[in-house]
C-alpha cells in the first residue's frame, strides 16, 4: 500500500487523499479479517463503473451490526453524500448476484487501487 503514494500528483490533489484513505481502510479490513467478515453476510454485487461509490454504499448499507465495515460505509458516504436521482438508481441496483462481504471488499479494493494508479480520483 505504501507504493500508492508514489502515484499521487505533486502538490495537493484533494480527492486523491480521500481515495487513498478509503483504500487504506479496506486494506485494514482485509488484513485484520480473522472470523468471516460480518459473519459471512451476503450483499449485492455491483458494477465497478460510473456511480461505483454510491452503488457500493447502497450495497454495504444493508449489512447491519457489523462494526468492521461501519467506517467504510461512512467513508463511502463521503464520496456520495447526497442521493442520486431516481433514474440513476435503477442503474445502481442491478440485483442479480449476491456475494460475501469479504469478497465484495476485496473486489472493491482491487478496483480502487487500479483507479488510484490511473489517477482517477473521482
Amino acid at each position: 500500500l505504501t507504493c500508492l503514494g508514489g502515484f499521487a500528483s505533486p502538490g495537493p490533489v484533494p480527492p486523491s487523499t480521500a481515495l487513498r484513505e478509503l483504500i487504506e481502510e479496506l486494506v485494514n479490513i482485509t488484513q485484520n479479517q480473522k472470523a468471516p467478515l460480518c459473519n459471512g453476510s451476503m450483499v449485492w454485487s455491483i458494477n465497478l463503473t460510473a456511480g461505483m461509490y454510491c452503488a457500493a454504499l447502497e450495497s454495504l448499507i444493508n449489512v447491519s451490526g457489523c462494526s468492521a465495515i461501519e467506517k467504510t460505509q461512512r467513508m463511502l458516504s463521503g464520496f456520495c453524500p447526497h442521493k442520486v436521482s431516481a433514474g440513476q438508481f435503477s442503474s445502481l441496483h442491478v440485483r442479480d448476484t449476491k456475494i460475501e462481504v469479504a469478497q465484495f471488499v476485496k473486489d472493491l479494493l482491487l478496483h480502487l487501487k487500479k483507479l488510484f494508479r490511473e489517477g482517477q480520483f473521482n
Epitope: L57, E58, M75, S77, F79, C80, P81, H82, K83
Partner: antibody, heavy 118, light 111 residues
Framework: EVQLVESGGGLVQPGGSLRLSCAAS????????MSWVRQAPGKGLEWVAS???????YYPDSVKGRFTISRDNAKNSLYLQMNSLRAEDTAVYYC????????????WGQGTLVTVSS | DIQMTQSPSSLSASVGDRVTITCKAS??????????VHWYQQKPGKAPKLLIY???NLESGVPSRFSGSGSGTDFTLTISSLQPEDFATYYC?????????FGGGTKVEIK
C-alpha cells in the same frame, strides 16, 4: 479536539459578496463530505450547500448560481463564496460534517453571522 | 421539495416527563427499506447536535433516553425521562431528496 470553527461573517450590502471559511481539526477532513447550513434569526434550519470528498458539489435552487462551496484539504478548510447577496440571506451560517444521506450531519461548528442590509 | 412538519411547535414539560415530538413528511422519505430522517437538538446560541440518524439509530454518545421511530411519512422522537439539559429545540431533517429539508422545530420548555 474534534471541531469546526467558522469565520468570515459580517455586515454586507445587498448585491455584495462575502467568503466564509471553516477550519476543521481533530478528524481526517479529506475523507468527509462537508456542508453549510444556515439559520435566519429566530427561524429554523436551511441546507445551503454540500461538497463530497471527491469535490462534487450540491446546492438548493435558492442559492444555485450565487453561492459556491469549495474545500482545501491541505489546509483542512471549507469555504462558501456568497455573491449577489440578498436580505433573505441574513442568517447564522453553520459548517457541518456531512456523513451522507444515511448518517446525517454529525458535527457542527458554532456558526458565523452574516447580515445583509443597506 | 419535501416539507417536514413538526408538532407541536412548542411544549412545556417537567423533569422526568416522557416527551414525544412528531414529524410528518409531505411524501415518503423511505429508501430501499431505510427511513432517511434524522433528529437534531439545538440549545439557545449553540450549534445543532445530531441525536438520531435513519429514524431510529442513536448517534454515538447520545443518552439512551432519546429514541426515534417511524417510517414512510410519520416519525417520532421520544425522550423517555426528560432531564434538565434536554430543554432545547428539536429539529427533524430528511435526506431522501434534494434539497435536504428540516422541520420547523419543536421547543421544549420547562413547565
Amino acid at each position: 479536539e474534534v471541531q469546526l470553527v467558522e469565520s468570515g461573517g459580517g455586515l454586507v450590502q445587498p448585491g455584495g459578496s462575502l467568503r466564509l471559511s471553516c477550519a476543521a481539526s481533530g478528524f481526517t477532513f479529506s475523507s468527509y463530505a462537508m456542508s453549510w447550513v444556515r439559520q435566519a434569526p429566530g427561524k429554523g434550519l436551511e441546507w445551503v450547500a454540500s461538497i463530497s470528498s471527491g469535490d462534487t458539489t450540491y446546492y438548493p435552487d435558492s442559492v444555485k448560481g450565487r453561492f459556491t462551496i469549495s474545500r482545501d484539504n491541505a489546509k483542512n478548510s471549507l469555504y462558501l463564496q456568497m455573491n449577489s447577496l440578498r436580505a433573505e440571506d441574513t442568517a447564522v451560517y453553520y459548517c457541518a460534517r456531512n456523513e451522507g444521506y444515511y448518517f446525517g450531519l454529525t458535527l457542527w461548528g458554532q456558526g458565523t453571522l452574516v447580515t445583509v442590509s443597506s | 421539495d419535501i416539507q417536514m412538519t413538526q408538532s407541536p411547535s412548542s411544549l412545556s414539560a417537567s423533569v422526568g416527563d416522557r416527551v414525544t415530538i412528531t414529524c410528518k413528511a409531505s411524501e415518503s422519505v423511505d429508501h430501499f427499506g431505510w427511513s432517511l430522517v434524522h433528529w437534531y437538538q439545538q440549545k439557545p446560541g449553540k450549534a445543532p447536535k445530531l441525536l438520531i440518524y435513519r429514524a431510529s439509530n442513536l448517534e454515538s454518545g447520545v443518552p439512551s433516553r432519546f429514541s426515534g421511530s417511524g417510517s414512510g411519512t410519520d416519525f417520532t422522537l421520544t425522550i423517555s425521562s426528560l432531564q434538565p439539559e434536554d430543554f432545547a429545540t428539536y429539529y427533524c431533517q430528511q435526506s431522501n431528496e434534494d434539497p435536504w429539508t428540516f422541520g420547523g422545530g419543536t421547543k421544549v420548555e420547562i413547565k
